[in-house]
């Protein structure tokens, strides 16, 4: 804490400039007006304070609002955003888009800080679901972001924000995450001819049925085993050797150089003998 | 562009272990094996064993199976290779490869690393 | 397991001139690969799938065979092609490597 004491004579701030970074800290909490600085708050990224100026700029600010940061301080805060905690975080009231975004650029090149994850939960759950505007831009700061969300956060996602998923937004999702999204891309692109729909669906299989992908067995689609390798096992065992043949069409010796490997192995192992001679890779049930 | 990052040289000692990393950037890490070959000094490669990233699924050359330890953190696409009971028979440079599930080899290396193992 | 048996172990030859050397396999393999390796640098694939030039290696590199012999052929031999060359089988398991050819510069 900064001791109050009064500020010299003709060292009152009429506005937030450059000068100020002369200022020791306690003239700083004594002659900087804090409804001053919450109008101004544009101007003080421009301006190398030192962290510990930022820390009494951030003091006077919390005087000022004792129950949370209106957003068009919010907006503006730009590197004192990174002083925050997730507690000061947690008491504002993020709606506007450009305001998470303007955040975001802040720790952008980071990995995702608790007060990032607290300032998107909070943007989240102040919009009541993750729409596609949110999600095109968090997945575009963090990649990873929608495998960071649990099965029943992931439930929320409506269909219609399917549309903004990129396929290595998906890398790190594991099978149960993948069994809450597939339903809703099969639902998001259930109107796309087949070859377009296998290209947008492909990154969601991981959480296909059987018959789902006993359908994509008649159509041609060519998949590969980095795709395959994903499929869930309990989808992939009841599939016989022509459905994978026709599965993988051309890839399908791909499955030797993996046939150690789950679900591979599992697969090849129900297989009859005779069946998996017929694709010449010299597979051993 | 695709890389490999190994981590540095090891000089351990006898009946010790060690775990060797392997960073991967430029492509996306779950669509291939990571792969682990042995070479000692003047010979030729060994083949240790790969890990699938999606699946954490992973074989091993019989030869290694007990004194390597293959695992993956895919939210950092890094590979590890722990090596345990280490001997002077393990003195040699080691390296991660990566392969493109479905096929059977290695497109990209790291620079290797260097275990010394001595008392 | 398949062993690879490389010849020569040991071999040189003049700027310009053709290069091959062999990769014999005690069993029927689907495919052979190809790597060279400089002292002091990590492998590099040449040739994957028998006879394929993989991405940025020279054309003078060619790969060709089948069942148990295979070969690698430099068709003008330069001074950065000295190194060593391995083949390697991914048809049974374990994979293995030959023992490699060191290809030196007359």
């Known amino acids: 804490e900064v001791e109050k004491t009064a500020c010299p004579s003709g060292k009152k701030a009429p506005e937030i400039d450059e000068s100020l970074i002369f200022y020791k800290k306690w003239e700083l909490e004594a002659c900087v007006d804090a409804a001053l600085l919450a109008t101004q708050m544009d101007r003080v990224n421009a301006i190398p304070f030192t962290y510990e100026q930022l820390d009494v700029l951030k003091h006077k600010l919390d005087e000022l609002y004792p129950q949370g940061y209106p957003e068009s301080v919010i907006q503006h805060l730009g590197y004192l955003f990174l002083k925050m905690s997730p507690e000061d975080i947690r008491k504002w009231n993020v709606t506007s888009l450009e305001t998470l975004k303007a955040l975001l650029e802040v720790n952008k090149g980071h990995e995702m800080s608790p007060q990032v994850a607290t300032l998107i939960d909070r943007f989240v759950k102040g919009r009541g679901q993750l729409d596609k505007d949110t999600l095109d831009t968090l997945t575009a700061f963090y990649p990873g972001y929608l495998c960071s969300l649990s099965p029943e956060e992931l439930s929320s996602v409506p269909p219609s924000s399917i549309w903004a998923v990129r396929p290595q937004d998906l890398d790190t999702c594991d099978p149960r995450q993948l069994d809450v999204l597939y339903p809703k891309a099969r639902l998001a692109f259930q109107n796309m001819n087949g070859s377009e729909y296998f290209v947008k669906i492909q990154s969601f299989l991981g959480g296909a049925p059987t018959e789902d992908l006993k359908a994509l067995s008649q159509q041609n689609v060519s998949m590969d085993l980095a795709t395959f390798m994903k499929l869930r096992t309990d989808a992939v065992l009841p599939l016989t050797v022509a459905e994978v043949q026709k599965l993988l069409g051309p890839h399908v010796e791909g499955l030797k150089a993996e046939e150690r490997h789950r679900p591979v192995r599992d697969w090849i192992l129900r297989q009859r003998q005779d069946d998996l001679d017929t694709l010449g890779l010299g597979l051993q049930g | 562009e695709v890389q490999l990052q190994q981590s540095g040289p090891e000089l351990v000692k006898p009946g010790t272990s060690v775990k060797i990393l392997c960073k991967a950037s430029g492509d996306t890490f779950t669509a291939y094996n990571m792969d682990w070959v042995k070479q000692r000094h003047g010979q030729s490669l060994e083949w240790i064993g790969d890990i699938n990233p999606n699946t954490d699924s992973t074989i091993y050359n019989q030869k290694f199976e007990g004194k390597a330890i293959l695992t993956v953190d895919k939210s950092s696409s890094t590979a590890y290779m722990e090596l345990r009971s280490l001997t002077s028979e393990d003195t040699a440079v080691y390296y991660c490869a990566r392969r493109k599930l479905g096929r059977g080899y290695f497109d990209y290396w790291g620079q290797g690393t260097t275990l010394t193992v001595s008392s | 397991q398949i062993v690879l048996t490389q010849s020569p172990a040991i071999m040189s030859a003049s700027p310009g001139e053709k290069v091959t050397m062999t990769c014999s396999v005690n069993l029927s393999v689907r495919y052979i690969y190809w790597y060279q390796q400089k002292p002091g640098s990590s492998p590099r694939l040449l040739i994957h799938?028998?006879?394929n030039l993989a991405s940025g290696v020279p054309v003078r590199f060619s790969g060709s065979g089948s069942g148990t012999s295979y070969s690698l052929t430099i068709s003008r031999m330069e001074a950065e092609d000295a190194a060593t060359y391995y083949c390697?089988?991914?048809?049974?398991?374990?994979?293995?490597f030959g023992g490699g050819t060191k290809l030196e510069i007359k």
């Open positions: 390697q089988q991914w048809s049974s398991f374990p994979y293995t």
């Open positions: 799938d028998t006879s």
